[in-house]
């Protein structure tokens, strides 16, 4: 007998659906109505038959109070190869809904996503999280799809993009944007962040992650930063190969006073880098390779700083004297 | 055992340039910043500065930005104490004491742990 | 910069009585505050950093204390080896560091 594609937990909270069989029943999926997050997986299937089963033109509005009803907040749909015209059906249908947070991960988006109408209402969502979702309309997806959605976007994550940089001057400005994660973007490097990073679309950016987008150096992240006019208070630069020193014919960058958190941990750093901002909140430099503690010009002032991970501090790797104060910890690095 | 002893000290006139040495033993010199402090007699310490032994970069007091030069000559493990144009309140003894840096989730800072004996400097005509 | 003001300049102290000196620093400086003591003619040693914490080998009997602007120390059963000046320093993060006035223990 093969396993039930959907299970539905004990509280009626959480629905994983996992439809690996060539002809799913979708209907199945009727048993998450009742979940607050719901979780739909195709196994790689073409969506492409779908569209001749459903009216993608069809009103929505027909449906607003059983969408409304839906319990579902948070939805993650992987794994397939949707239509552009299914995709915004679904979100033409979902903008009725109570849904909040959106996740698509390993989805191949063909065709084009037609304009709003302008009867519709766009997709309230707090969240969009996109992974390794690849898009036919290519450089200007963002923009196709920021126009189903409602202007209070307050997170977005882009992972695995394979045209991580935007068509700018079609993007509208996020204005609730707050928190914006291009981590795992390992082509991105700092001239693809400049291009990614639309001046002024995102102007209430408060975190910005960052971690294993193909930074150099930190400076260089400043450049990019100062050029988009962002100005975060908490940057996540983890998982990068940095160097620490600068190019000594490179401009000096002056970071934002917003900034207040930076991350630099698991960087590969040698030394502490130069040019970090004169006063932080929150530094992370545990799991680097520094090999000797820092001196008092080579930190910046910082209320909150991890070490923790790097060989001057493990027992064994440095001989700090008996008087120095360890942390005692040694973190799986 | 870690070690620092200062030389170059004594009885100079008023005017002269004087160089007071700083000679480290028992671990790495580059590792760990360097320190000058100035006692006057009967008196209190006085943080004169401090310089960075991976680039020799110097850092002076607000009292020490004129007449007061430190460096470094890495491959003998010293550092420096310059002072030029010596007056009567130059007279005290002088200290070089290492920055020894301590680290224990999240605090951290500086303390000078190792100091040097000292070296007494008599500016008199 | 930051000044820090000692309080007494000196103490006349029997052994094995208790001792508290006060440091008082001119803006908050957190926990950054480092106490060293001073024998005659010999160079300062460290006891106390980061306000509280004991120095390698040093006994027990010296304590500190305080945050933001007021600083204590004590020796809480005073020695004859004691007597000696005691200063404390403001070790800020980051530069410059400034030593208080220092306060000398006598014997009574």
């Known amino acids: 007998t093969t396993p039930e594609p959907c299970e539905l937990d004990d509280e009626d909270f959480r629905c994983v659906c996992n439809f690996s069989e060539p002809q799913p029943d979708w209907s199945e999926a009727f048993q998450c109505v009742s979940a607050v997050e719901v979780e739909i997986h195709a196994g790689g299937l073409n969506l492409e038959p779908f569209l001749k089963r459903v009216d993608a033109d069809a009103d929505p509005r027909q449906y607003a109070d059983t969408v409304k009803a839906l319990r579902v907040r948070r939805l993650t749909v992987g794994a397939a190869q949707v239509p552009a015209q299914l995709l915004v059906g679904a979100l033409r249908v979902l903008a009725y809904s109570r849904l909040k947070e959106l996740t698509l991960e390993d989805l191949k988006i063909t065709g084009t996503m037609p304009p709003l109408p302008l009867e519709a209402t766009g997709l309230a969502l707090s969240s969009l999280r996109l992974r390794n979702v690849s898009w036919a309309t290519g450089r200007s997806w963002l923009a196709e799809l920021q126009q189903w959605l409602k202007p209070g976007l307050k997170v977005l994550s882009i992972a695995q993009a394979h045209s991580p940089a935007f068509s700018c001057e079609q993007v509208r400005a996020f204005p609730a944007l707050t928190s914006l994660d291009l981590s795992d973007n390992p082509g991105l490097g700092e001239r693809g962040l400049m291009a990614a990073l639309c001046p002024h679309k995102f102007p209430a950016i408060q975190n910005l992650a960052l971690r294993n987008t193909g930074m150099e150096t930190p400076t260089g992240v400043c450049a990019a930063l100062a050029a988009a006019g962002v100005q975060p208070h908490s940057l996540d630069l983890s998982h990068n190969s940095l160097r620490a020193t600068v190019n000594p014919s490179a401009p000096r960058c002056m970071w934002s006073s917003a900034l207040n958190s930076l991350n630099l941990s698991f960087a590969g750093l040698e030394q502490v880098p130069k040019g970090l901002p004169a006063k932080l909140r929150v530094l992370d430099l545990s799991c680097n390779r520094l090999n000797r503690a820092p001196q008092p010009d080579e930190l910046p002032e910082v209320d909150n700083l991890t070490l923790d991970g790097n060989p001057f501090l493990v027992p064994g790797t440095a001989l700090p004297h008996e008087g120095s104060m360890n942390s005692g910890v040694v973190p799986a690095c | 055992e870690v070690k620092l002893l200062e030389s170059g000290g004594g009885l100079v006139q008023p005017s002269q340039t004087l160089s007071i040495s700083c000679k480290a033993s028992?671990?790495?010199?580059?590792?760990?910043?360097m320190n000058w402090v100035k006692q006057a007699p009967g008196d209190g310490l006085k943080w004169m500065g401090w310089i960075n032994t991976q680039t020799g970069k110097p850092t002076y007091a607000d009292d020490f930005k004129q007449r007061f030069v430190f460096s470094l000559e890495t491959s003998a493990s010293t550092a420096y104490l310059q002072i030029n144009n010596l007056n009567i309140e130059d007279t005290a003894t002088y200290f070089c004491?290492?920055?020894?840096?301590?680290?224990?989730?999240?605090?951290?800072?500086?303390?000078?742990?190792?100091w040097g004996p000292g070296t007494m400097v008599t500016v008199s005509s | 910069y930051i000044v820090m003001t000692q309080t007494p300049t000196s103490i006349s102290i029997s052994v094995g009585e208790r001792v508290t000196m006060n440091c008082k620093a001119s803006?908050?400086?957190?926990?950054?505050v480092d106490w060293y003591q001073q024998k005659t003619g010999q160079s300062p040693k460290l006891l106390i950093y980061?306000?509280?914490n004991r120095y390698t080998g040093v006994p027990d009997r010296f304590t500190g204390s305080g945050s933001g602007t007021d600083f204590t120390f004590t020796i809480s059963n005073m020695q004859a080896v004691d007597l000696a000046v005691y200063y404390c320093?403001?070790?800020?993060?980051?530069?410059?560091?400034?030593f208080g006035g220092g306060t000398k223990l006598e014997l009574k």
């Open positions: 004491t290492r920055s020894t840096f301590y680290y224990s989730s999240y605090i951290y800072g500086w303390y000078f742990d190792f």
């Open positions: 803006q908050n400086v957190g926990s950054n």
């Open positions: 028992g671990y790495t010199f580059t590792d760990y910043a």
């Open positions: 320093m403001q070790s800020n993060t980051n530069p410059p560091w400034t």
């Open positions: 980061k306000a509280s």
